[in-house]
């Protein structure tokens, strides 16, 4: 089925939502004053070999559990990330965006990345896809 303007708009909105969530996480943790940042950086994430299409979001989906584990370290009285809710929201968006019709086997790069590099990669991906839709 050819994409309609309404389905394109929906995809764009979902990507913008995903982008905002990823940026919020990054801004919340990538602060030189964050007392847990150095320890959060010891966690390693798998990066996609290729991320140019919505189906490649499978690679993000597979890393959401490790992401939640690291985000559990990021809470403070004045910064309520609520990792479980946030990851659940991201998961819903990712599932809708990548679709469940085709099963895509994610291919990962050899080198692992820090949480900051990982988030930046998926932020760049989201921005890139949004730019092709607008």
């Amino acid at each position: 089925m050819a994409p309609t303007s309404s389905s394109t708009k929906k995809t764009q909105l979902q990507l913008e939502h995903l982008l905002l969530d990823l940026q919020m996480i990054l801004n919340g943790i990538n602060n030189y004053k964050n007392p847990k940042l150095t320890r959060m950086l010891t966690f390693k994430f798998y990066m996609p070999k290729k991320a140019t299409e919505l189906k490649h979001l499978q690679c993000l989906e597979e890393e959401l559990k490790p992401l939640e584990e690291v985000l559990n370290l990021a809470q403070s009285k004045n910064f309520h990330l609520r990792p479980r809710d946030l990851i659940s929201n991201i998961n819903v968006i990712v599932l809708e965006l990548k679709g469940s019709e085709t099963t895509f086997m994610c291919e990962y790069a050899d080198e692992t990345a820090t949480i900051v590099e990982f988030l930046n990669r998926w932020i760049t991906f989201s921005q890139s896809i949004i730019s092709t839709l607008t």
Partner: antibody, heavy 121, light 111 residues
């Protein structure tokens, strides 16, 4: 019971190499970071560095960078602290400890019993 | 690195005494509403034992006679009624900034 058990006391000569261990039990070893702390005779505590046993990622106190190497083998729930060339000034008690950092805190909740390292010619 | 200065460095006290140990940081150890200051007890030949975390939270299994308070740069560990098993050295530790640092210790001896 959650515990960290360290290897026994060591007596070494200057220039020799050494690797001491810290074995975790009673909990999921890869779910918690392991820290190393030095206590020189009659002195206070100094943080040396940390390892994530799940990923192997490390972070060192600048003071100890290049002086020691921290590693881990998650298959046997063990973290290590090693020296390639010991000095007399490395004589101290070395502790491993488990880092807790979920929620609103960051502290060492479980400690090993310590490993005494004596370096003397 | 953040310097932690404990006072006094040592003192003598009797069983039943109320004991207060202070720890002053060279800069604030607060972050987004939390004070990253912990207290440990160490007995001769033994490993340190956690007493208080995040300035005022009592570790599970630690007697309620121990309490912690403070924020910013000034912190206090209080033992409301000293018991014989409390004679030991006490260390404060900041976990707000790497490298984590410890105070020089306060040795509590029997009078």
């Amino acid at each position: 019971e959650v515990q960290l058990v360290q290897s026994g006391a060591e007596v070494k000569k200057p220039g020799e190499s050494l690797k001491i261990s810290c074995k975790g039990s009673g909990y999921a070893f890869t779910n918690y970071l392991i820290e190393w702390v030095r206590q020189m005779p009659g002195k206070g505590l100094e943080w040396m560095g940390v390892i994530n046993p799940g990923s192997g990622g490390t972070y060192y106190n600048e003071k100890f960078k290049g002086q020691v190497t921290i590693s881990a083998d998650k298959s046997i729930s063990t973290a290590y602290l090693q020296w390639s060339s010991l000095k007399a000034s490395d004589t101290a008690m070395y502790y491993c400890a488990r880092w807790r950092g979920e929620g609103y805190y960051a502290y060492f909740d479980v400690w090993g019993q310590g490993t005494t390292v004596t370096v003397s010619s | 690195a953040i310097r932690l200065t404990q006072s006094p460095s040592s003192f003598s006290a009797s069983t039943g005494d109320r004991v207060t140990i202070t720890c002053k940081a060279s800069q604030s150890v607060d972050y987004q509403g939390d004070s990253y200051m912990n207290w440990y007890q160490q007995k001769p030949g033994k490993a340190p034992k956690l007493l208080i975390y995040t300035a005022s939270n009592l570790e599970s299994g630690v007697p309620s006679r121990f309490s912690g308070s403070g924020s910013g740069t000034d912190f206090t560990l209080t033992i409301s009624s000293l018991q014989s098993e409390d004679f030991a050295t006490y260390y404060c530790q900041q976990s707000n900034e790497d490298p984590y640092t410890f105070g020089g210790g306060t040795k509590v001896e029997i009078k």
